[in-house]
Interface confidence: low
């Protein structure tokens, strides 16, 4: 159904517009494939307006449809590094609450050293997004090569 | 802090919604790695609503957080063309004012012939975005293969 | 020209915000390069709010500038599958009405198995978007690997 038949006026706050852009803080310890993120003006051009970080993972504060985007660049990489013998894959998903756990976006580094994608997905308040990097290759921490963000689009 | 605690009504103009989608005009002369862009209805499906072009570079007119996106396809390219012997890299950054110069987004063509990515970033009125293509390979000018755009997202 | 000099108040409905995110249903029969899409809550995380599906193709219901995005992953693929000898290409375009037929976004799988991109483009009510995958390789139907969506951005 259409999202607003009623013609009510909208205050800015009700538009939502929650938005976050994060930079890589660090990778997880052995056996933890998650990437840990950080954000805030003191760190450069990353920020959180609405969503929050919970132990390096992004937690949503407002229900709605979001545009989720990510770019990850492998740190020590040539076109031969990421071959099918050592598949390196990035997956973005809801990791908690467990009842809503699902993979939202998945990409493999075949003969490339960077993946970048984006998608629209419904998210709910309390959803925590995790980004799992499987394989033996390490991501670059350069802020223009590796970043992760969300943008609230509509209710 | 949250961007609007006050519940004021919003006129359309104040929403900003500055937006631009550009097509490649030409590459720079020797020693100038910048791509020069063009936009406008007469050129096809490119446009500028708010931002302006300054000698082929995109200048921002409204402060805010923007979604910046780009796709560049190399013109004469096979999966072997862009090898480790000839690294071709695309970088999008603020190139003026000099005090705000920074690289926002960077990708290398490893064994691929197209890069595409997007990110959220704060931009200020007067910021000029430059797209630098380093390497010996030329970009395609096909409007469905190479394009660059920004979208105002929120204050 | 600026899109709204008048300072009129905006009801939510007039903001548009038409949005859709689709998952792959099936490929076309021999000689039909189109991908056929599906969407709706019963299918998972795909949805249509405004646009509609017409025989698996996405039809726009509201004039405006849209962000179009897509990711397609090849199903049986290694880094050598899509080689220079055998180009597999994805093109997103307006396929009807015929008078507005145009390619909006095009990418080739060179030595990669996934393409992902996005662009801003003006679309009009009644425009139908088709996604053509040329070549003999089949796309993955995993919902986190292959998806297609649009987001209304502004009038």
């Amino acid at each position: 159904q259409r999202f607003a038949q009623a013609q009510q006026q909208l205050p800015l706050e009700s538009l939502g517009w929650d938005v976050a852009e994060l930079q890589l803080n660090h990778t997880g310890p052995q056996q933890d494939p998650r990437l840990y993120w950080q954000g805030g003006p003191a760190l450069g051009r990353s920020f959180l307006h609405g969503p929050e970080l919970d132990k390096g993972q992004l937690r949503i504060h407002r229900d709605g449809i979001y545009m989720v985007h990510i770019q990850v660049t492998l740190a020590i990489c040539s076109s031969t590094t990421a071959s099918r013998h050592h598949p390196t894959t990035l997956a973005v998903g809801i990791c908690s609450p467990a009842s809503r756990s699902i993979s939202l976006l998945r990409l493999s580094f075949h003969q490339g050293c960077t993946i970048a994608s984006q998608r629209l997905t419904p998210l709910a308040r309390g959803d925590t997004l995790c980004t799992n990097l499987t394989g033996t290759l390490l991501p670059s921490r350069n802020t223009d090569e590796t970043f992760f963000g969300v943008q609230w689009v509509r209710p | 802090q949250r961007f609007a605690q006050a519940q004021q009504q919003l006129p359309l103009e104040s929403l900003g919604w500055d937006v631009a989608e550009l097509q490649l005009n030409h590459t720079g002369p020797q020693q100038d790695p910048r791509l020069y862009w063009q936009g406008g209805p007469a050129l096809g499906r490119s446009f500028l609503h708010g931002p302006e072009l300054d000698k082929g570079q995109l200048r921002i007119h409204r402060d805010g957080i923007y979604m910046v996106h780009i796709q560049v396809t190399l013109a004469i390219c096979s999966s072997t063309t862009a090898s480790r012997h000839h690294p071709t890299t695309l970088a999008v950054g603020i190139c003026s004012p000099a005090s705000r110069s920074i690289s926002l987004l960077r990708l290398s063509f490893h064994q691929g012939c197209t890069i595409a990515s997007q990110r959220l970033t704060p931009l200020a009125r007067g910021d000029t975005l430059c797209t630098n293509l380093t390497g010996t390979l030329l970009p395609s000018r096909n409007t469905d293969e190479t394009f660059f755009g920004v979208q105002w997202v929120r204050p | 020209q600026r899109f709204a000099q008048a300072q009129q108040q905006l009801p939510l409905e007039s903001l548009g915000w038409d949005v859709a995110e689709l998952q792959l249903n099936h490929t076309g029969p021999q000689q039909d390069p189109r991908l056929y899409w599906q969407g709706g809550p019963a299918l998972g995380r795909s949805f249509l709010h405004g646009p509609e599906l017409d025989k698996g193709q996405l039809r726009i219901h509201r004039d405006g500038i849209y962000m179009v995005h897509i990711q397609v992953t090849l199903a049986i693929c290694s880094s050598t599958t899509a080689s220079r000898h055998h180009p597999t290409t994805l093109a997103v375009g307006i396929c009807s009405p015929a008078s507005r037929s145009i390619s909006l976004l095009r990418l080739s799988f060179h030595q990669g198995c996934t393409i992902a991109s996005q662009r801003l483009t003006p679309l009009a009510r009644g425009d139908t978007l088709c996604t053509n995958l040329t070549g003999t390789l089949l796309p993955s139907r995993n919902t986190d690997e292959t998806f297609f969506g649009v987001q209304w951005v502004r009038p």
Partner: antibody
Framework: QVQLVESGGGVVQPGRSLRLSCAAS????????IHWVRQAPGKGLEWVAV????????YYADSVKGRFTISRDNSKNTLYLQMNSLRAEDTAVYYC???????????????WGQGTLVTVSS | DIVMTQSPLSLPVTPGEPASISCRSS???????????LDWYLQKPGQSPQFLIY???YRASGVPDRFSGSGSGTDFTLRISRVEAEDVGVYYC?????????FGPGTKVDIK
Amino acid sequence: QVQLVESGGGVVQPGRSLRLSCAASGFTFSNYGIHWVRQAPGKGLEWVAVIWYDGSNKYYADSVKGRFTISRDNSKNTLYLQMNSLRAEDTAVYYCARDGGYSGYDSGFDYWGQGTLVTVSS
Amino acid sequence: DIVMTQSPLSLPVTPGEPASISCRSSQSLLNSNGYNYLDWYLQKPGQSPQFLIYLGSYRASGVPDRFSGSGSGTDFTLRISRVEAEDVGVYYCINSLQTPFTFGPGTKVDIK
């Protein structure tokens, strides 16, 4: 099913020319690179030439470079080998072979024709 | 040009027994993408060659699993775990890394 059928072989005098054809069926010819491979009587295999799916690139063995020309007509699903200035050592069975790249790898000749015999003799 | 050598050039075999053929290249066939561009073909008597192994160790479609390929760089081996009568013929390795592609001289396998 995939089929490659060579034709055009025969007996020819040294210094003369001959054109071989390879008719393809059962697959999308315009998607595949195609090779010519030859085998002299009682000898091993020798790669001769390759042409890209769209004809944009062609490569040759040193032994035939400048004398042989590989070409294709995708509208006719046909591959050609124009052989000029023929020599006795060009005597061989000539096979066309499809490049297997589209089957999931980019090396290997996955389908071969039955071959056509070229005899260069005075 | 890359030169390919094979050994032995002739290999008498007993059905049911294993057999192996060696192939060497004058320079590495390990491509920048991590794959070894070395293929194996079998030419049975009176027939066109048929595809066996690609990229060093990957069996082509329809090839029985008694055939296996191994090796990297410049040294490669084709193994038949249990030879069958239908396996007789000449086995060729080929450099498919760069043009000109070059075949080895072939190894003739026949029943003792």
